[in-house]
Interface confidence: medium
């Protein structure tokens, strides 16, 4: 029997500016029941205040909702393990909001094929923003990723459409099956992952509707 | 603790490429921006770029043709190219973590920096 | 790109005085989140910089107190209130909101 070992905290995640949550591995219980708690200070401030949620986001989680989450401060985090052998704190992790934004993946993506007036067939791609970002007012300006590839190919096409919400594909093989998703990043975060599939298949005969 | 540890050729050949390697240890490269700096002799600090935790990159404008920043997250290394060398990028070449997690700026730990003299 | 310009360009003290360096964008450094990411470094002779203050005005860990910065927009200013011998050396300003990011000019802290 022993104290524990050092906690770390290893990831931390913002869908949308104004809720995250910190993750932590737990690292050895030294053999004894262990306590965890999660502690954080703000910049500028002397004060060190406990974890506000730690059930919302599941083991080893805090969440910090609304009413604790603040894009002007850095919270300087830390996770202190705690046994009857002793006690072991994680190194401090410095988390500005706005550095740790992962949205949810955009939605109703919706595909269409189309035929210009040279008979030439594309794909239209259109998607919509996730529904928790703001996009409208600036508070998020988010950029887009689609991927596709055929039901056989191996490979996914990458295509990045900047700020723009649809896009047109070419050159596409009549007669197969593609699958499409789209993603998201806003201008500071990271990408969100691939949102639903959708497959349409390239009719062979495509003939123009009124 | 956080250390970065540099390695590279101190001597290059004008025109030749440059490439120095940063080590890092105490921290995961998932989670945290290297960046590249750079200080002539007897001068200023330079800013030349960054490799974010994600992998993006931003460089430096007057540079941006002749720089390359990558890594490689499983081996805790990250690469600096610079193509084109002249006399005048006879520097010393640091590279430095991240304050935040997942952030950018705030250079809170650095390299012990490489001693590059671009010369014939 | 945005130019900082450190003021003044060396700074003789005595130790135990207060020394203030100051240090003006040529735009406002206002990050598109509303933080202005404005950092003040420390450079010994043979040595690596050191980061003292970050965002304007929160003191790096194990940075002594005696260091503050503050300003805003296109202003900013460190101070060291009573100068001790280990605080001699370089100081650069940087700005970390609008890439490329930029450094001041340097301000040498040195013995009058």
């Known amino acids: 029997q022993s104290p524990p070992g050092k906690p770390e905290i290893h990831k931390c995640r913002s869908p949308d500016k104004e809720t995250f949550t910190c993750w932590w591995n737990p690292g050895s219980d030294g053999g004894l029941p262990t306590n965890y708690s999660l502690t954080y200070s703000k910049e500028g401030e002397k004060n060190t205040y406990e974890c506000p949620d730690y059930k919302t986001s599941g083991p080893n989680s805090c969440f910090f909702s609304k009413q604790y989450t603040s894009i002007w401060k850095i919270y300087i985090i830390t996770v202190n393990a705690t046994n009857e052998m002793g006690s072991s704190t994680s190194d401090p992790l410095y988390v500005d909001v706005t550095y740790i934004v992962e949205p949810e993946p955009p939605r109703n993506l919706t595909l269409e094929v189309k035929q210009l007036k040279d008979k030439k067939t594309y794909l239209w791609v259109k998607w919509l923003p996730p529904t928790i970002t703001d996009v409208k007012t600036g508070w998020f300006t988010m950029e887009y990723e689609i991927r596709l590839k055929s039901e056989e190919a191996d490979e996914w096409e990458i295509h990045f459409t900047g700020h723009q919400t649809q896009f047109k594909v070419f050159d596409l093989y009549p007669g197969q099956k593609y699958l499409v998703q789209t993603r998201c990043k806003p201008d500071h975060g990271y990408w969100s992952r691939w949102g639903q599939e959708k497959s349409i298949e390239i009719p062979n005969d495509f003939t123009l509707k009124d | 603790q956080v250390q970065l540890q540099q390695s590279g050729p101190g001597l290059v050949a004008p025109s030749q490429s440059l490439s120095i390697t940063c080590t890092v240890s105490?921290?995961?490269?998932?989670?945290?921006?290297v960046n590249w700096v750079r200080q002539p002799p007897g001068k200023g600090l330079e800013w030349l770029g960054i490799?974010?935790?994600?992998?993006?990159?931003n460089y430096n404008s007057a540079l941006m043709s002749r720089l390359s920043i990558s890594k490689d997250n499983s081996k805790s290394q990250v690469f600096l190219k610079m193509n084109s060398l002249q006399t005048d990028d006879t520097a010393m070449y640091y590279c430095?973590?991240?304050?935040?997690?997942?952030?950018?700026?705030?250079?809170?730990?650095w390299g012990q920096g490489t001693l590059v003299t671009v010369s014939a | 790109d945005i130019v900082m310009t450190q003021t003044p360009l060396s700074l003789p003290v005595s130790l135990g005085d207060q020394a203030s360096i100051s240090c003006r964008s040529s735009?406002?450094?206002?990050?598109?989140?509303?933080?202005?990411?404005l950092e003040w470094y420390l450079q010994k002779p043979g040595q690596s910089p050191k980061l003292l203050i970050y965002?304007?005005?929160n003191r790096f860990s194990g940075v002594p107190d005696r260091f503050s910065g503050s300003g805003s927009g296109t202003d900013f200013t460190l101070k060291i209130s009573r100068v001790e011998a280990e605080d001699l050396g370089v100081y650069y300003c940087?700005?970390?909101?609008?890439?490329?990011?930029?450094f001041g000019g340097g301000t040498k802290l040195e013995l009058k």
């Open positions: 965002k304007v005005s």
């Open positions: 735009q406002s450094i206002v990050h598109s989140n509303g933080n202005t990411y």
């Open positions: 490799i974010g935790a994600g992998g993006s990159t």
């Open positions: 430095a973590r991240s304050l935040y997690y997942y952030g950018s700026s705030s250079f809170a730990y």
């Open positions: 105490g921290f995961s490269l998932t989670s945290y921006g």
């Open positions: 940087f700005q970390g909101s609008h890439v490329p990011w930029t």
